[in-house]
């Protein structure tokens, strides 16, 4: 048990286990929406230079890939897996890898993934062959 842990009135932010140690937030790529050259590839790097400390300890890393008539974008953020994002549930939020899954959206091709390892949304996977791979 730590010799000193600050008190908190916000148990949602102050997450600790039975041992008294305080849970860390995740580290995720967080560039919001950026133009991307990722297209027709089995996997891509985010090319996001910002690794942010997520605001709350239960947040996970998320990536959203979108393609329409005009451009391709990649969005990288932290997000609470209990809440929807762009109207969709975050599937596989406990996964160590960010494996993209297509979502139905009018007027664009839309893929989203969530994962829970440091900077896991830096490497996004489209190929189905990766979906059964085990954590590193």
């Amino acid at each position: 048990i730590p010799p000193h842990v600050p008190k908190s009135v916000n148990s949602d932010v102050m997450a600790s286990d039975n041992g008294g140690a305080v849970k860390l937030p995740q580290l995720c790529k967080f560039c919001d929406v950026r133009l991307s050259t990722c297209d027709n590839q089995k996997s891509c790097m985010s090319n996001c230079s910002i690794t942010a400390i997520c605001e709350k300890p239960h947040e996970v890393c998320v990536a959203v890939w979108r393609k329409n008539d005009k451009n391709i974008t990649l969005e990288t953020v932290c997000h609470d897996p209990k809440l929807t994002y762009h109207g969709f549930t975050l599937e596989d939020a406990a996964s160590p890898k960010c494996v993209m899954k297509e979502k139905k959206r009018a007027g664009e091709t839309f893929f989203m993934c969530a994962c829970n390892m440091e900077e896991c949304n830096d490497y996004i996977i489209f190929s189905e062959e990766y979906t059964t791979s085990s954590p590193d």
Partner: nanobody, 124 residues
């Protein structure tokens, strides 16, 4: 015995600067990722910044990007936080914390030791 001792807090005007220090002892400083965490009055914890033990790779909360700089001097077992362009909302007790080793999975990642904190007040 692990000890983390913060210093450098105080009263500063908005737009001003402060440099916090955290003197570490009782463990091998060069083996651990270190963090600065803050708690504003009546609020929860906010994870401000972290730095790797070797290579000095750094991470920041989005609320402090471009204003705060974390650094460490492994030869002195000391962690630093340079805070510039301070705002009223930066008012908080600032703690340095040691991360438990070798955990990249969020569910297993923990802080195991904390300092007693140093108070930073930003007010005109």
């Amino acid at each position: 015995e692990v000890q983390l001792l913060e210093s450098g807090g105080g009263l500063v005007q908005p737009g001003g600067s402060l440099r916090l220090s955290c003197a570490a002892s009782g463990f091998t400083f060069t083996e651990y990722r270190m963090w600065w965490v803050r708690q504003a009055p009546g609020k929860g914890l906010e994870w401000v910044s972290a730095i790797e033990p070797i290579g000095n790779r750094t991470y920041y909360a989005r609320s402090v990007f471009g204003r705060f700089t974390i650094s460490r001097d492994n030869s002195k077992n000391t962690l630093y936080l340079q805070m510039n362009s301070l705002r009223a909302e930066d008012t908080a007790v600032y703690y340095c914390a040691k991360q438990m080793p070798g955990q990249k999975w969020m569910a297993k990642s923990r802080f195991d030791y904390w300092g007693q904190g140093t108070l930073v007040t930003v007010s005109s």
